[in-house]
């Protein structure tokens, strides 16, 4: 969480941003909130990205003002116009690109004063893993697959019964480049698995951590997946 204050001339207002991560090819949110004003026409929101000549987005007098918008963001940004009056200056970023990563600044001007805060935005690819029993294999084998990751993650297997065991010798992980030549499909195979045990396939890079669990008993198979974004800090 980053909290910024405005200084010089007029009063300062508190602006708060939260560091976040975007999944390339999907839509993302750059979070920014501020002390609200009673008049929408008095609120100016300006989003900047460090190293970019134009603006990311500008909203003033109740509408978008995009004459100075940088080409790299053209047609890809929007504020939540109906929520600006209550202090939400968050920016929706469509079709997140790898190059959208960087430091952003959310500037706010209201009748009460002005303020700004920075936001670190990471980009990459992350997806839920699915763990299945590989019935084609000669021995009891589990197969963990996740369709889109970038940068290349690490894959670690764990088991409920053999806690702390190192499965690197009995697993094999491969990364297959997807058609867009950026993201990769992750496939990890775990051999010599035992019945009545819960296995976890943990995939992690510097943006996200995902876990796929599978519990195999003689009567049923239970699966569960979980994904967590890393380093979501407010400022």
């Amino acid at each position: 969480l980053i909290i910024g204050f405005g200084i010089s001339g007029r009063h300062s207002i508190t602006v708060t941003t939260v560091a976040s991560a975007g999944n390339i090819g999907e839509d993302g949110i750059l979070s920014c909130t501020f002390e609200p004003d009673i008049k929408l026409s008095d609120i100016v929101i300006q989003w900047l990205k460090e190293g970019v000549l134009g603006l990311v987005h500008e909203f003033k007098e109740g509408k978008d003002e995009l004459s100075e918008q940088d080409e790299m963001f053209r047609g890809r940004t929007a504020v939540f116009a109906d929520q600006v009056i209550v202090g939400n200056a968050s920016l929706r970023l469509k079709n997140v690109q790898l190059t959208d990563a960087g430091t952003y600044k959310c500037y706010i001007i209201t009748s009460k004063g002005k303020g700004n805060a920075n936001l670190e935005y990471k980009t990459g690819a992350f997806s839920m893993p699915e763990v299945n029993v590989d019935y084609n294999a000669s021995s009891e084998t589990l197969r963990c697959e996740a369709p889109r990751w970038f940068p290349q993650p690490t894959v670690v297997w764990a088991s409920q019964v053999d806690q702390g065991a190192n499965f690197s010798e009995v697993s094999n992980t491969s990364f297959e480049l997807n058609s867009e030549n950026v993201t990769m499909k992750v496939v990890s195979v775990l051999y010599n698995v035992t019945i009545n045990n819960t296995y976890s396939c943990m995939i992690e890079n510097d943006i996200a951590k995902a876990t796929g669990d599978i519990k195999v008993t003689e009567s049923e198979i239970k699966r569960r997946s979980h994904l967590q974004l890393l380093n979501s800090k407010a400022s």
Epitope: G9, V52, L53, T99
Partner: antibody
């Protein structure tokens, strides 16, 4: 630490060509737009040209449009300015600048270009 | 093109003085104005961006204000290291323009 080092300046005859380079280090070069700004001897600053981080967008001052070309090689962290049809009024110290929040936050020490017969 | 006019062109002052430099734009540039300090034979150094934001590492005696057309750079208490030439610069559009400069010299 951000460092920008210009090179390629020198004496050239009117109508001649020169290529300036700016070697960048200490930051992720491809993420930052870059600019060239010049300063004639004893005079003020004059913006020459800018280029976006990926090199896809370029901008020029009217005084150099059609004669100068800005480019970058992100694999080598290098910014370039190709100057053709040089005139006496192009004589100046040429600075490369890294763009921060829309403006130049770090500048090199400059390279002198003298156009004279 | 947007023109910037700085005043005064030269300013004589003493250490400890409060110094104000004005920059006037030919049309509104919102808050897209920067201030630079340049010493003889050296590259310009960014002091203020977006009219009033202090660049990291710049002493707090420097401050900027204004929006639209009229802008000011203030040095609250002039130090020996502050004798230099100061330039305002607009970046409201993709083409930058600079003021003609203000030389701050020792009285």
């Amino acid at each position: 630490e951000v460092q920008l080092l210009e090179s390629g300046g020198g004496l050239v005859q009117p109508g001649g060509s020169l290529r300036l380079s700016c070697a960048a280090s200490g930051f992720t070069f491809s993420s930052y737009a870059m600019s060239w700004v010049r300063q004639a001897p004893g005079k003020g600053l004059e913006w020459v040209s800018s280029i976006s981080g990926n090199g896809g967008s370029t901008y020029y001052a009217d005084s150099v449009k059609g004669r100068f070309t800005i480019s970058r090689d992100n694999s080598k962290n290098t910014l370039s300015l190709q100057m053709n049809s040089l005139r006496a009024e192009d004589t100046a110290v040429y600075y490369c600048a890294k763009v921060g929040w829309r403006t130049g936050d770090y500048w090199g020490q400059g390279t002198l270009v003298t156009v004279s017969s | 093109d947007i023109q910037l006019t700085q005043s005064p062109s030269t300013l004589s002052a003493s250490v400890g003085d409060r110094v104000t430099i004005t920059c006037r734009a030919s049309q509104s540039i919102s808050s897209w104005l920067a201030w630079y300090q340049q010493k003889a034979g050296k590259a310009p150094k960014l002091l203020i961006y977006k009219a009033s934001d202090l660049e990291s590492g710049v002493p707090s005696r420097f401050s900027g204000s204004g929006s639209g057309i009229e802008f000011t750079l203030t040095i609250s208490s002039l130090q020996p290291d502050d004798f230099a030439t100061y330039y305002c610069q607009q970046y409201n559009s993709y083409s930058w323009t600079f003021g003609q400069g203000t030389k701050v010299e020792i009285k």
